[in-house]
């Protein structure tokens, strides 16, 4: 119900959004689920990661970047059929440090657009944004000299998966806090598509048992569990052919083949 | 730092109107959902009304649905709630609230409201 | 309308653990907040989503919620720490509190 922003006086850009919706804030609902979805950002002019709680919020929310573009971003579509030319930094390294509501103590990296540099942070462990790496190597890697990729654009490759403080796939608890652990997922040359295809089932935090589907990236098929009606996360649909539609494309048979469709 | 001072409490007869201001300080202010809670005296507490920042949507108890109007001034950073059709049972004191991702994060003091004949 | 249900009273001795729970319906699937109030005073949040605390807090307020149930527990409660204390949740765009619940620090 809040409109939750920053504490700042900066008006908003010039920039009109295609919908009187796309200018409201990051609205996460008072619910505990935690699903990765997207909003467009009108200080910013992107569309930026945030996690949703799974219940009220308000309508800007996509499930997917592409859809918060082109729902957001006037004349996105004209723009993303051009061929992309070199490389380009993804959004989330122009996001602001965020250590998130936790009180772990990890060291990370994060790419400072002031300075055009990675530099180390500290992370509390949970939440927080996508600007957030194990290693220096991997921050460079993707924000200070990203290197032209050949796959899917807007399809987000495992390294932003693999530090993504936002994901929960192991659970273990600090002071009663979800506290992401690193997944263990097949290595990065493997698999090519959407990262949350790579997480494990999980049945989430509620008492109902609905029937879900999730895909075994080990296996290569999308297998049946039980759901229990929030939190969990993204690998789960409602049919078999919906997550093989959105899983199985993202393998790679073969790294001179590319990516099987 | 974060200030909400009410006004605008009193005595006031039963089918009477009142109209409570809230000013804000410390904070943006047009960014922020806004809510009045009540406590009548000796009770627990009792959300009357909600609006949503710098977007026009308001929400109301069922007790006060078409008797109270909340709404807000930006430019002086200040939230009222016009309450007309009073009665005994509103007795109580009137508290302003900053609504932060669905709980109340700053309150105000609060003004009492007396109905009574 | 929606229910949450508190003890409208919990004593503890000074130094003993007091625990003040919260049912509803929602519960699992909804966050649960906490204020204190002391006597003529406005309430202030003391457990945020379930269990976080706010800064100026002190450690000793904990606060969990699981099945139906959310519950706020004070360790080594001190004379200070008597109050009425309500959780809070959201639904359907409105917030609801439970009844209160008055703690008593015996002695």
């Known amino acids: 119900l809040s409109e939750e922003a920053d504490d700042t006086d900066s008006e908003l850009g010039s920039m009109k959004p295609l919908h009187t919706f796309c200018a409201m804030k990051a609205d996460d609902g008072p619910c505990k689920a935690m699903i990765r979805s997207y909003f467009f950002n009108m200080y910013t002019h992107q569309c930026e990661e945030f996690i949703y709680g799974g219940c009220e919020g308000n309508e800007n929310r996509f499930d997917t970047l592409e859809e918060c573009k082109k729902t957001c971003i006037p004349g996105y579509e004209k723009t993303a059929v051009k061929a992309a030319s070199g490389a380009e930094r993804p959004d989330f390294c122009f996001l602001e440090e965020d250590p998130g509501l936790c009180r772990g103590y990890m060291k990370r990296y994060l790419y400072n657009n002031q300075t055009k540099q990675c530099e180390r942070f500290v992370y509390g462990g949970c939440l927080g944004n996508r600007n957030n790496f194990e290693t220096l190597d991997e921050c460079k890697k993707i924000c200070e000299n990203p290197v032209h990729s050949p796959s899917p654009v807007n399809e987000v490759q495992m390294s932003d998966y693999v530090t993504d403080g936002n994901t929960v796939t192991d659970r273990s608890t600090v002071n009663n806090i979800v506290v992401p652990q690193s997944p263990k997922v097949p290595r990065r040359r493997d698999y090519r598509g959407r990262p949350w295809c790579l997480q494990p089932a999980d049945s989430g935090l509620c008492k109902a048992s609905e029937r879900r589907f999730y895909y075994n990236s080990a296996t290569g098929k999308c297998h049946r569990f039980n759901y229990t009606g929030c939190g969990g996360n993204n690998n789960n649909f409602t049919t078999r052919r919906r997550c093989l539609r959105s899983c199985k494309t993202g393998l790679i048979k073969n790294k001179s083949k590319g990516v099987v469709k | 730092q974060v200030q909400l001072v009410e006004s605008g409490g009193g005595l006031v007869q039963p089918g009477g109107s009142l109209r409570l201001s809230c000013a804000a300080s410390?904070?943006?202010?047009?960014?922020?959902?806004m809510s009045w809670v009540r406590q009548a005296p000796g009770k627990g507490l009792e959300w009357v009304s909600s609006?949503?920042?710098?977007?026009?949507?308001?929400y109301y108890a069922d007790s006060v649905k078409g008797r109270f109007t909340i709404s807000r001034d930006n430019s002086k950073n200040t939230l009222y709630l016009q309450m007309n059709s009073l009665r005994a049972e509103d007795t109580a004191v009137y508290y302003c609230?900053?609504?932060?991702?669905?709980?109340?994060?700053?309150w105000g003091q609060g003004t009492l409201v007396t109905v009574s004949s | 309308s929606y229910e949450l249900t508190q003890p409208p009273s919990v004593s503890v001795s000074p130094g003993q653990t007091a625990r003040i729970t919260c049912s509803g319906d929602?519960?699992?699937?909804?966050?649960a907040h906490w204020y204190q109030q002391k006597p003529g005073q406005a309430p202030v949040v003391v457990i945020f989503?379930?269990?976080n605390r706010p800064s100026g807090i002190p450690e000793r307020f904990s606060g969990s919620n699981s099945g139906n149930t959310a519950t706020l527990t004070i360790s080594g409660t001190q004379a200070m720490d008597e109050a009425d204390y309500y959780c809070?949740?959201?639904?359907?765009?409105?917030?609801?509190f439970g009844g209160g619940t008055k703690l008593t620090v015996l002695g």
């Open positions: 410390g904070f943006t202010f047009r960014v922020y959902g």
């Open positions: 929602n519960l699992p699937k909804y966050y």
């Open positions: 809070q949740s959201w639904l359907s765009g409105t917030p609801w």
């Open positions: 609230a900053r609504v932060y991702r669905y709980w109340f994060d700053y």
């Open positions: 609006d949503r920042g710098s977007r026009s949507s308001t």
């Open positions: 989503r379930d269990s």
